[in-house]
Amino acid sequence: SQVSQNCHNGSYEISVLMMGNSAFAEPLKNLEDAVNEGLEIVRGRLQNAGLNVTVNATFMYSDGLIHNSGDCRSSTCEGLDLLRKISNAQRMGCVLIGPSCTYSTFQMYLDTELSYPMISAGSFGLSCDYKETLTRLMSPARKLMYFLVNFWKTNDLPFKTYSWSTSYVYKNGTETEDCFWYLNALEASVSYFSHELGFKVVLRQDKEFQDILMDHNRKSNVIIMCGGPEFLYKLKGDRAVAEDIVIILVDLFNDQYFEDNVTAPDYMKNVLVLTLSPGNSLLNSSFSRNLSPTKRDFALAYLNGILLFGHMLKIFLENGENITTPKFAHAFRNLTFEGYDGPVTLDDWGDVDSTMVLLYTSVDTKKYKVLLTYDTHVNKTYPVDMSPTFTWKNSKLPNDITGRGPQ
C-alpha cells in the first residue's frame, strides 16, 4: 500500500534497512558508522551549494526472532517484514537503502508499489537486473558475465592468441552471497555466458574438481571458481595440475593482492585472479587494529548510497523539482556522482560500473601482477603486461581445448 514519505518541507529522510540477514557479515555498527559519515558529507555538500535543508537517516532494525540464519537464506520475508514495519509506523523516507540479499530485494521489488528509489549494497543476482527503481552499488553478476565473455573471445593479445568457447564452473553450494549469485549466473542455461559458450559443465563435488586437474579427457582447460586463495588451497591443496589448466579465481571484493609484501603461494601459479581495482582505498592490513579501514566494500557501498541520494537531492532541489515523484524514483541511473573515494558511475540500469583487474602470479618474483584491466562501463579490455612471466608455455595462455597447446 501507499505510504506517506517523510520527504518534504526542507526535511529529507533516508530509510536504512538494517537486516539480520545480510550479504556480508559486517557488523551493523560499521554500517551505521558508514551511513553517518555519508550524512555528514551530504549535509556539507548541500550547505556548500546554498541549500539549507535537513537530511537524516532512520535505521530500521529487524527483530531477528524469526529470520535468524544470519545469511541470505531467510531474507525473503525479512525484507517484507521490515517494509511492513515502516508502513505501520508511517516512517518511509525519500529513499530506501537496504536489502543486500538478492532474495529479499527481488521480493520487495515484486511485492511493493515502489514509487521511491531503492539502493542496494549487493543484490548480485540476475533476477535483480533491469529494475527501474533499483540501484546496485556493488558489481552485479551481469558485469562479471560480460567480462568473462569478452575475455573468452579475446584472441589478439600477445599473451592470449586463442578465443575460448568452453569452461568448467566449480560451484559446491558453500559460497558466500556474492559468489553464489556470480556462479549462479554462469550456471544458468539462459544466461549470456551460457549462450556464448559451446561447452560448459558445472562441477559440484570437490572430487570432480580434483579429477579434472589431471584428466586427459577433460573437455576444457579452463575452470572458473569464486573465493579467495585459501578457498582454492582447501580444494586443490598441493595436487599436481596439468600444464594447460587455467583456473580463473573470481575474488572481486578482496584487495589483499595489492598489499605490500604479499607473496603469491605456489598453488596460485596456474591461477588468474579477477578482482576489483582497489582505487584510493589501498590499505596495509598490518596497521588496521580492530577497525579494519574500509577495504570493506559493503560498508563503503552504504556510504556511497547516502552520497548518491545527496547528489540526486541536490540536483532536484536546485531545479525546483519535487522529490516524491516517479521521476525522482527513476533518476538514480545513467550518471556519475562523487563517491567517498572519487567518482562513481552508474549504468543505464542503475548498476555500478567499475574497473576489474585480472592478476597473474609472476614465476620470477612470486608476486601478483596486473595482466589486464576491464572497464565494465564500455565493456572493453585493456592489456597491461604485454610480456607476462607466466607459468604457461611460451608465456601465453593455452587453448581452452586440451591437446592444442599454444602455437
Epitope: D33, A34, N36, E37, L39, E40, I41, G44, R45, N280, S281, L282, L283, N284, F287, S288, N290, L291, P293, T294, K295, E338, Y340, D341, G342
Partner: nanobody, 123 residues
C-alpha cells in the same frame, strides 16, 4: 605504532595566517579520515575540521568556516590546516587526529591523536 606529529604553530598577530602540518607514520594514511581539534586553556577540546580519506570532501566547524582550509597529501602522509584571518579566540593547542570516518573523528570514536602544536594569536 601510530604517530601523528604536528608542526607549524607559533605566535601570530590578529589577522595573520599560519599553516599547520601533521606528518603521519605507522598507519595506512590514505585509508583514514584526518582532522584537526583544538583546546583553549580551561576549555573542552573542540573539533575544527576534517577531510575524507580521498581528500574529496572537507568539513568545518562554524568557527572555522571561511577562514580555515584543510587539505591532505596522501603521497606525503601529511595533513595541513591553512588558517587565515586569525583571531585571539583561535588561541589554543591544535591537535591532529585520525579515524576511519570524519563522523567517527568528530565523536572521538577510536581516534588516533598527535601531541599538539600551540597557536597563540595576539591582539
Amino acid at each position: 605504532q601510530v604517530q601523528l606529529q604536528e608542526s607549524g604553530g607559533g605566535l601570530v598577530q590578529a589577522g595573520g595566517s599560519l599553516r599547520l602540518s601533521c606528518l603521519a607514520s605507522g598507519l595506512a594514511f590514505p585509508s583514514y579520515a584526518m582532522g584537526w581539534f583544538r583546546q583553549a586553556p580551561g576549555k573542552e577540546r573542540e573539533w575544527v575540521s576534517c577531510v575524507t580519506r580521498s581528500g574529496g570532501d572537507t568539513l568545518y566547524a562554524d568557527s572555522a568556516k571561511g577562514r580555515f582550509a584543510i587539505s591532505r597529501d596522501n603521497a606525503k602522509n601529511t595533513l595541513y590546516l591553512q588558517m587565515n584571518s586569525l583571531k585571539p579566540e583561535d588561541t589554543a593547542m591544535y591537535y591532529c587526529a585520525a579515524a576511519l570516518f570524519c563522523a567517527n573523528l568528530r565523536r572521538n570514536k577510536d581516534n588516533y591523536w598527535g601531541q599538539g602544536t600551540q597557536v597563540t594569536v595576539s591582539s
